[in-house]
């Protein structure tokens, strides 16, 4: 069964700067990745970035840099200033559209006891089957 993992990290150098890493554990070919915050995309969440492996990347503030790390994982750096900056309990979600598995989404947030610059190891978050 495919799984999605989400890792959220607060940068030690900029306490309001976050790095989100997401990965897809499955055998299918990924056709689109959507990163959102405030909840799952389409369920109250706000899209931060969309990554298409053959067309490119689209991001919206406060996203600073979205990128593919591997064929099945992505990372997103968020700016840490302004009214739209994230806070420690913000939920981030990643949705992977894959063929033939369909769409899989998982969410995560900064571990409550995390020190800046540290994060929990990437583990599969609760999986939501989108379709």
């Amino acid at each position: 069964t495919p799984e999605v993992w989400v890792q959220v990290r607060m940068e030690a150098t900029e306490l309001s700067s976050f790095t989100i890493r997401c990965g897809f554990l499955g055998s299918g070919s990924i056709s689109l990745v959507t990163v959102s915050w405030g909840g799952p995309n389409g369920a109250g969440g706000t899209t931060l970035a969309v990554l298409h492996p053959e067309r490119g990347i689209r991001q919206w503030a406060p996203a600073r840099q979205a990128r593919w790390e591997t064929q099945s994982s992505i990372s997103l750096i968020l700016e840490g200033s302004g009214a739209s900056s994230p806070c420690a309990n913000t939920t981030f979600c990643c949705k992977f559209a894959s063929f033939p598995e369909g769409s899989w989404e998982a969410c995560g947030s900064l571990p409550p006891s995390s020190d800046p610059g540290l994060s929990a190891p990437p583990t599969p978050a609760p999986i939501l089957r989108a379709d």
């Epitope: 969309v50 298409h52 492996p53 490119g56 990347i57 600073r64 593919w68 064929q71």
Partner: nanobody, 118 residues
Framework: EVQLVESGGGLVQPGGSLRLSCAAS????????MGWYRQAPGKDRELVAT???????KYVDSVKGRFTISRDNAKNSLYLQMNSLRAEDTAVYYC????????????WGQGTMVTVSS
């Protein structure tokens, strides 16, 4: 499919300048890496310069200080300002785009000829 169309090539004297442009058909997504490559007659295609959508730039040593790569993300357009041109810069210059930065799918333009000769 992303289409890339180059323009700006031509004949120029040694020491002269040219500005190449590359327009991409993709208008919604930013192409992660865009770059210029060139192929001189009888030689292999070689990298000239690349730029990511966040502005990270790389140049081949032979053009450093003479060529400047830039891009307009809003238009997904790529540029190459070529100054102090030399005869050895004569080549067909190709625009390249790697939307993911992983090489999963790479697109090429048709090329534009740059001839440096007196």
């Amino acid at each position: 499919e992303v289409q890339l169309v180059e323009s700006g090539g031509g004949l120029v004297q040694p020491g002269g300048s040219l500005r190449l442009s590359c327009a991409a058909s993709e208008t919604y997504f930013d192409l992660y890496v865009m770059g210029w490559y060139r192929q001189a007659p009888g030689k292999d295609r070689e990298l000239v310069a690349t730029i990511t959508y966040t502005g990270s730039i790389k140049y081949v040593d032979s053009v450093k200080g003479r060529f400047t790569i830039s891009r307009d993300n809003a238009k997904n357009s790529l540029y190459l300002q070529m100054n102090s041109l030399r005869a050895e810069d004569t080549a067909v210059y190709y625009c390249n785009a790697d939307p993911s930065g992983l090489g999963r799918k790479v697109y090429w333009g048709q090329g534009t000829m740059v001839t440096v000769s007196s």
